[in-house]
């Protein structure tokens, strides 16, 4: 029940924020109109209208970024609990530690904000619908990939090393990382891990990255990959690569050979179909359908303490 209350509170908060933005926009519009009248030139008015449209567009983009960030969150948009509430300390994952509710964003088409609201969901749906039109064109281009099975081999999972991490300038719960993934230039990655991993533990950390999600802006910062984490409603842990891994090492799956897509087509929801079969097993080893995330010749990827947990 407490969870439901929290969700409802957040919904109300989002509603209030939306009202404030609308009010602010109304004020801006009227100010611009007054200004145009005062200056009394058609040319100036036209210029202001263009400016106003730009502002609106910018706001729309920001809204969409927020929304997309959350669509991509793995959140499943807070389905209201229908089952019996459970005591999390009973899990076979003996050492799952209770902690507060959780947010892990990263990038691409499936950020990891764990915990979204109904407003966010609606907004996400809008974005997805808009995206659908554009993607119809892309579909024919990507059509050749249709014959490929939808399994983990489609994902470009690689070892990365976080070179630097800093707080996102405009979002308290997000980090912005520069990550070496074995390419010429590092990739910028936005992750919602602020409430789960201290900043100093992010520096020079080896991580597993999903590299072929469509890059997405996260509160104004373009995120080019997603940090893979073991995740439960209580806790998030960054998955750890095996010792001896180096940036750029590929994660492979014995039973699922195949080359990853260059970029996952968001329209086809490939990540969304694969993600439910990603779990840590009883030994905290990251797996797809029970097959370990493996760096050939070096070992498997693990969570620190979270067994039988989802991966996002």
């Amino acid at each position: 029940m407490a969870n439901n209350d929290a969700v409802l509170k957040r919904l109300e908060q989002k509603g209030a924020e939306a009202d404030q933005i609308i009010e602010y926009l109304k004020q801006q519009v009227s100010l611009l109109k007054e200004k145009a009248i005062l200056q009394a030139t058609l040319r100036e008015e036209k210029k202001l209208r263009v400016e106003n449209a730009k502002l609106k567009k910018e706001i729309e983009e920001l809204k969409q970024e927020l929304i997309q960030a959350e669509i991509q969150n793995g959140v499943k948009q807070i389905p209201f609990p229908s089952g019996t509430p459970l005591h999390a300390n009973s899990m076979v994952s003996e050492n799952v530690i209770q902690s507060t509710a959780v947010t892990t964003v990263s990038s691409g088409t499936k950020e990891q904000i764990k915990g979204g609201t109904g407003d966010e969901k609606k907004a996400k749906e809008k974005i997805e619908k808009k995206g659908e039109k554009k993607e119809k064109k892309q579909q024919s281009i990507a059509g050749s990939a249709d014959s490929k099975p939808i399994d983990v081999s489609r994902l470009d999972l690689r070892i990365g090393c976080i070179i630097t991490a800093r707080k996102h300038p405009d979002a308290d719960s997000l980090y912005v990382e520069e990550v070496d993934v074995g390419e010429i230039a590092p990739r910028t990655v936005v992750s919602g891990l602020v409430n789960h991993v201290p900043l100093e533990q992010m520096q020079n950390r080896m991580v597993i990255l999903l590299c072929n999600l469509k890059p997405a802006k996260m509160r104004g910062v373009l995120s080019q990959a997603m940090v893979m984490c073991a995740s439960s409603p209580e806790k998030i842990e960054i998955l750890a690569p095996p010792n001896g891994s180096v940036p750029g090492d590929r994660i492979t799956f014995d039973a699922f050979p195949g080359e990853p897509d260059k970029e996952l087509n968001p329209k086809k929801k490939i990540w969304e179909q694969i993600q439910p079969d990603l779990h840590t097993n009883d030994e905290c080893v990251a797996t797809y359908k029970g097959v370990p995330f493996e760096v050939k010749g070096k070992g498997v990827c693990r969570a620190q303490t979270m067994s039988n947990s989802g991966i996002k």
Partner: antibody
């Protein structure tokens, strides 16, 4: 192919000891938790013990019915798991299976029979 | 400990008909993650058990789509549609939410 082969079963008297073994091949043994499950003649399955991997400090877990009498151990260099059974009771008579599972992939040995009788 | 209780089948089941095996747990196996920590195993006569279903409803590799798992937090059903000879054996449910891991007493499926 994955193989789990149990050995060391046999006939013992109550209060005596016995150590059964399981040799694993065909998968990365050191990454897998290992379990012993038993089945008394004509009865259902009963979980007995579990041992975790080195990164999880080889933590062990036991069913209440065997706690203090049975000890599970492993040797990753030999891909072996063992069950040391002390102070055996007649109700420990069962087929003992060595097993490991990871979602889609679960592996069971053919079982080894342990009979405790006076 | 979590107690798993299995129901009996009206044996034998006519070939080609469907069979539903039920299992009840003394405590909800639905975790806050939304996953239900329940496995189904089949032990064919003279063989070791093998996994059919995990997370209550996910079929393991190579398991026929005639088998499906469903349920709530405490009441579970394994449905076998169009029963065949290869389905004969004892079916066990098992919880893996907490230790000790516990199995149901088993449900025997025989074919007419």
């Amino acid at each position: 192919a994955v193989h789990l082969v149990e050995s060391g079963g046999g006939f013992v008297q109550p209060t005596e000891s016995l150590k059964i073994s399981c040799a694993a091949s065909g998968f990365t043994f050191s990454d897998a938790a290992m379990y012993w499950v038993r089945q008394a003649p004509g009865k259902g399955l009963e979980w007995v013990a579990r041992i975790r991997t080195k990164p999880n400090n080889y933590a062990t877990y036991y069913a209440d019915s065997v706690k203090g009498r049975f000890t599970i151990s492993r040797d990753d260099s030999k891909s072996m798991v063992y069950l040391q059974m002390d102070n055996l009771k007649t109700e420990d008579t069962a087929m003992y299976y060595c097993t490991s599972w990871s979602y889609d992939f679960d592996y069971w040995g053919q079982g080894v029979m342990v009979t405790v009788s006076s | 400990d979590i107690v798993m209780t299995q129901g009996a089948l009206p044996n034998p089941v006519p070939s080609g008909e469907s069979a539903s095996i039920t299992c009840q747990s003394s405590k909800s196996l639905l975790h806050s993650s939304g996953k239900t920590y329940l496995n189904w195993y089949l032990q064919r006569p003279g063989q070791s058990p093998h996994l059919l279903i995990y997370w209550m409803s996910t079929r393991a590799s190579g398991v026929s789509d005639r088998l499906s798992g469903s349920g709530s937090g405490t009441d579970f059903t394994l449905k076998i549609s169009s029963v065949e000879a290869e389905d004969v054996g004892v079916y066990y449910c098992q919880q893996f939410l907490e230790y000790p891991l516990t199995f149901g007493s088993g449900t025997k499926l025989e074919i007419k």
